[in-house]
Structure formats: C-alpha cells, structure tokens
Interface confidence: low
C-alpha cells in the first residue's frame, strides 16, 4: 500500500502479512496486507485491527477489527463507545456510510481515525497529537512502526522511477515479484492518467499513486482509494500547506 | 512483555523473607510505586496484554486503598498533560482527563497534530 507517515514521508510499500502501523502507550494499530495479484509485489490492506488500550476512568480496552467486505460500526464486543467508565463517551464509533466509511473519535487522546473500504481493500487515516505519537516507553528497542518510521528500505517500491517507464512495460515489471502476473483489464498509460486526472486534478503523489495502482492492477477502485485518501488528509491534516506532496522523500526509514 | 517480572519483583518486595513490607507501611507504597514504574517501562511491549492491564488496574486500586501518593522516590517523570496509560491517578468526577484538548489548553495553546494514512497498493 501507499503510506504517508507522521513526518509526511510518502512511500509505496510491498509489506506483506501483519505489520504494526501505530504502537504507543495508548493505541495499537496493525494491518494485514495481501498481494493484489498472484505473484505481485504490490500489496493492499485486507485487514485492520485497532486496540484502544485501557485508560484511567475514560475507557476500557476496546478492539476494533475490519476486514475485506466487513467494515463494522462497532468494536468486537458489540459496543460503540469506551465501555462502562465515567468517560466512556470519549471513545466513539460513527458509521458515515454503511459498510464503507467509519470514523472513530478517541477524544481522551485527541485522536480521530477514519477507516474506509474502497473496492475490495481498506484504507486508514489518523490525526493524532505529537505527544501521543511520541508516548513510547522504549525508543531503543522499538521495532518498525510504519506510521512513525516508514517502511524498511527493502520493502519499498520506487514508484516514481516507475512513472518514468510507465508508457512502456515499467508498470508490470515493478509490480511483479516473479514473472509478470496477468492483471485483468490493465489500462494503457493514457487511460490510467485520464481516469486519475478526473478525480485528482493536481499531479501530486496521490495522483501518481493512483496511476501506479491502475497500471499495476487494472482495478479502477484504486482511483477512489487515492481520492478518498486525499480527502481524509484534507480533513485530518493540521497543516493545510502540506495536503499535496510532490516529492517522495528517499531517506532511510526512521 | 516483562509484566511477569514486574509482578514477581512486587511480590518479593511485599512478601519476601527479609523484612517484608506490610501493607500499611510507607515501604508498601514505595513497592507499589516501583511496581508502577516497572509496568510503565514495559508498557510498549505489553500492548493488549491482559496480565499487563490487570496489573495496572491492580496498582491503581492498591494506591487508592492504601492512600499512597502517586509521587515518590521511584516515580518517573511524566508527560505534561497525558499520564502514562493506566497510571494511577486520583479519581475525579470530572471527565476532563477524558478530553485531551481541554486538558491540554490548561498548559499551552493548541496541541501539534500529525497525520498518517495508508491506502491503495
């Protein structure tokens, strides 16, 4: 999937299986990514688990779990708030669009999470205070938490390099781990560009991600995934000058 | 997750063979504070861990039952506005602690927010 980190780095990651997205003293978010096509290095998010940890007199521990074709508007125990404590309503789930768009407000840690199902896959967006992001006990032994440190270098796909080759065979070459998988109805480059331009007129990294996804998979739903990801940034990002990212930062993760 | 280590350190401090702390002495409160500190140090690796969360609850209960002050020689410096998860605190009828922004405004202007997103392939 494409990842925008807390420090506004933008990466395309081929991480497969379960990876921690956020892990601090208050919240743990884990995603499971699966290949979009057999043999493809490109992956998308098929499962999301969020653990809101027990916090004082505000909330009991609550677990939210979403999977492909299952975007519940409740925690796994069936509740929609933080439990029986005095401040339980400081954690709330709201269904915005049934089966497609859920918002979780965790006021006790100043955090808003948006989970969507777009096509077959899930998208995730969060707004969180720096103080909460950095509420980590042991920095030295902290592993790879994607939102904080980005993807390991060996798990990144350089999709900007891919764009320079995109008119040719670049898309299939980069997306394939082994011999190129046969994607159903992959688009010609021009069609992909046109479809992405409709939804994403600014040629930023969200637009580029959209083109990459269409050329990689042929699945037009990825246009919407990029569009909604940018909409969520508009809603959640505190710096309106940083809505559009244009250059992918190439630093090492961390 | 080293919560079992924290548990056993607390048990040995409060029921060890050499001058155990009885539960109405200052030593008991000191042992509790050490226990709380130990749980905070292991918090990151104990995410979602029932033993960990139960221990944190237990400490909170014992601190209030025995009127232990939460600050003491073993207490760890804490975040300005946000206590460590599940850390013991005086109970309050006001849910202000459950509203981050209200709690934050007491100390400074607006918190700095960050964003992370994951989408597509």
């Amino acid at each position: 999937p494409h990842l925008r980190t807390f420090t506004d780095r933008f990466q395309t990651c081929k991480v497969q299986g379960a990876w921690p997205l956020i892990d601090n003293n208050y919240l743990n978010v884990q995603v499971t990514n699966t290949p979009v096509l057999p043999g493809s290095a490109a992956t998308a998010t098929s499962k999301l688990t969020i653990i809101f940890k027990n916090f004082q007199e505000c909330v009991d521990q609550k677990v939210y779990q979403a999977e492909m074709d299952e975007l519940p508007a409740a925690f796994v125990d069936g509740s929609k708030n933080g439990g029986d404590k005095h401040g339980a309503n400081s954690l709330k789930i709201t269904e915005k669009v049934s089966g497609q768009h859920v918002e979780i407000q965790a006021k006790y840690i100043g955090t808003t999470i948006v989970v969507r199902q777009v096509g077959r896959y899930l998208t995730f967006a969060v707004r969180m205070p720096e103080e909460v992001v950095n509420a980590v006990e042991d920095w030295d032994s902290q592993g790879l938490y994607l939102c904080l440190r980005g993807c390991p270098l060996n798990q990144q796909i350089d999709f900007q390099a891919f764009h320079t080759n995109a008119e040719g065979t670049g898309a299939r070459r980069l997306a394939a781990a082994s011999p190129a998988p046969t994607a159903p109805e992959t688009f010609p480059y021009e069609t992909a560009v046109a479809k992405c331009k409709e939804k994403l007129p600014v040629e930023d990294l969200y637009y580029q991600a959209c083109v990459f996804d269409l050329l990689t998979t042929g699945d037009v739903n990825f246009t919407l995934a990029a569009y909604y990801a940018l909409e969520d940034v508009k809603m959640l990002h505190s710096n309106k000058d940083k809505l559009h990212l244009y250059e992918r930062t190439r630093d090492l993760p961390g | 997750c080293k919560i079992l280590k924290c548990n056993s350190e607390f048990w040995s401090a409060t029921s060890g063979s050499h001058a155990p702390a009885s539960d109405d002495t200052p030593e008991f409160c000191a042992a509790l504070r050490s226990y709380a500190l130990c749980t905070r140090r292991t918090a990151r690796t104990c995410r979602g861990d029932l033993a960990y969360h139960s221990a944190v609850h237990g400490i909170e209960d014992l601190m209030s039952q025995h009127n232990c002050s939460k600050d003491g020689p073993t207490s760890q410096p804490r975040l300005r506005t946000l206590p460590p998860a599940g850390d013991s605190q005086e109970r309050s009828d006001s849910p202000e602690i459950c509203h981050y922004e209200k709690s934050f405004h007491k100390h400074s202007a607006t918190p700095n927010y960050t964003h992370c997103g994951l989408f597509g392939d």
């Epitope: 299986g17 499971t32 009991d60 779990q65 796994v76 125990d77 | 221990a55």
Partner: antibody
Framework: EVQLVQSGAEVKKPGASVKVSCKAS????????ISWVRQAPGQGLDWMGW????????NYAQKLQGRVTMTTDTSTSTAYMELSSLRSEDTAVYYC?????????????WGQGTLVTVSS | QSALTQPRSVSGSPGQSVTISCTGT?????????VSWYQQHPGKAPKLMLY???KRPSGVPDRFSGSKSGNTASLTISGLQAEDEADYYC?????????FGGGTKVTVL
C-alpha cells in the same frame, strides 16, 4: 506455588446445567486472565473462552455463545464456568488455565481437570 | 475439524529428532506471533512447552524448540527421550480467534 484447583466430577442429565469451579492460589488472581478449555474422550483440546478476573470481561467461543457463562469471585480467587442446555456431546474433561500474557496468547498453568458426564 | 492441521502421529528412536508441523491460514498462523505448544500425557492436564512461536517457559528442556515458516509452525524435539512420549497440541491466537490443532501423538520407539 501457582496452582489452579478444580471442583470434582459431575454427572448431569441432558438439558441440565453444570457449574465448574477453579480456585487459584500462589499469584495475584486479578493479574491474569482465566481460559477454559475442554477435551472430549479421546479427542483434542477445544477452547471455550476466557474471562478477566479484574474487569469481568469475557470472550466466548462462537459455537458456545448463549450456553456458556464465565464468572469470577475475586474475594475467593475462584473462577466459574457454567454450561447450560447440556447434551451428550458436552461430555468432556473441562480445564481452567491461567492466561500467561494476555487474552488467548498462551496458558501457562492448568487445573487438574473436571470430568463432566452428560447421560440420560 | 480443526482449523490448525497437525499430523496424527510421529515417532522416533531415543536420541533422534522429531518435528511436528502445525499448518493454518495466513491469519491463524502466518500473521500470528502468538503460537504456543502444549504437551499432554494420558490422563493429565496439558503443559505449556513453547509460547510466542519460539519462547520456552522456565523448566522446559532446551531440546524443545519452535519455529515458523509461512503458514506453518513447527515444534522440534531433539534428542528424543522416553518421557517425551505424549500428545502435542499447537495453539494460535490471531485477532479474535483462538484455535487448537488436532493434536499429534509422539511415540518413542
């Protein structure tokens, strides 16, 4: 020594209920969850659910929802598992086990087991 | 039918190594770090042998070791001894599911 001691064997008729107890000692009861696992004669282990003695939170195996109730009494450090509407296939040895490090992750101390026979 | 598949039985002579496999899905084993193994002698309660895939509780001999590759977790007993003859069960937690394998009978020849 950390120990879980379970109540004695029970014989029940189909449709009845059974309540098995599990008394914990040697550790802080509220610091660990309790899982319940059963084993039918000659069969494998079957997870039934768990309970947090501190909060009373429970999580039951889907197939037992509505028939199983897990409770604890922290004053006596005892966990209870009640199974209702018993049928012959509920004949099994029922074990309680201490959850070592979080819900479901692993069970580090087990009771000796309680044989429940359901027979008309 | 268990969602975690184990061989019915494995056997080995004293001193040999045996490996028991436990195969599940990506969510039950592949993505889970919470795989544990239990030993059960006839008429006795199970005993924890390994947890979190590879970790050994104190008191468990170091001839018991664990590993995981893809959707298969494995328990290896090296230097098999007579007292290792028992049933072995794998157990996995992933998300809200918790599962046991069907069990493997280890016979020491």
């Amino acid at each position: 020594e950390v120990q879980l001691v379970q109540s004695g064997a029970e014989v029940k008729k189909p449709g009845a209920s059974v309540k098995v107890s599990c008394k914990a000692s040697g550790y802080t009861f509220t610091s660990h969850g309790i899982s319940w696992v059963r084993q039918a004669p000659g069969q494998g282990l079957d997870w039934m659910g768990w309970i947090s003695p501190y909060s009373g939170n429970t999580n039951y195996a889907q197939k037992l929802q509505g028939r199983v109730t897990m409770t604890t009494d922290t004053s006596t450090s005892t966990a209870y598992m009640e199974l209702s509407s018993l049928r012959s296939e509920d004949t099994a040895v029922y074990y309680c086990a201490r959850v070592g490090s979080g819900p479901y992750y692993y069970m580090d101390v087990w009771g000796q087991g309680t044989l429940v026979t359901v027979s008309s | 039918q268990s969602a975690l598949t184990q061989p019915r039985s494995v056997s080995g002579s004293p001193g040999q190594s045996v490996t028991i496999s436990c195969t599940g899905t990506s969510s039950s084993v592949g993505d889970s770090i919470y795989v544990s193994w239990y030993q059960q002698h006839p008429g006795k309660a199970p005993k924890l042998m390994l947890y979190d895939v590879t970790k050994r509780p104190s008191g468990v001999p170091d001839r018991f070791s664990g590993s995981k590759s893809g959707n298969t977790a494995s328990l290896t007993i090296s230097g098999l001894q007579a007292e290792d003859e028992a049933d072995y069960y794998c157990h996995s937690y992933a998300g809200t599911d918790t599962l046991f394998g069907g069990g493997t009978k280890v016979t020491v020849l």
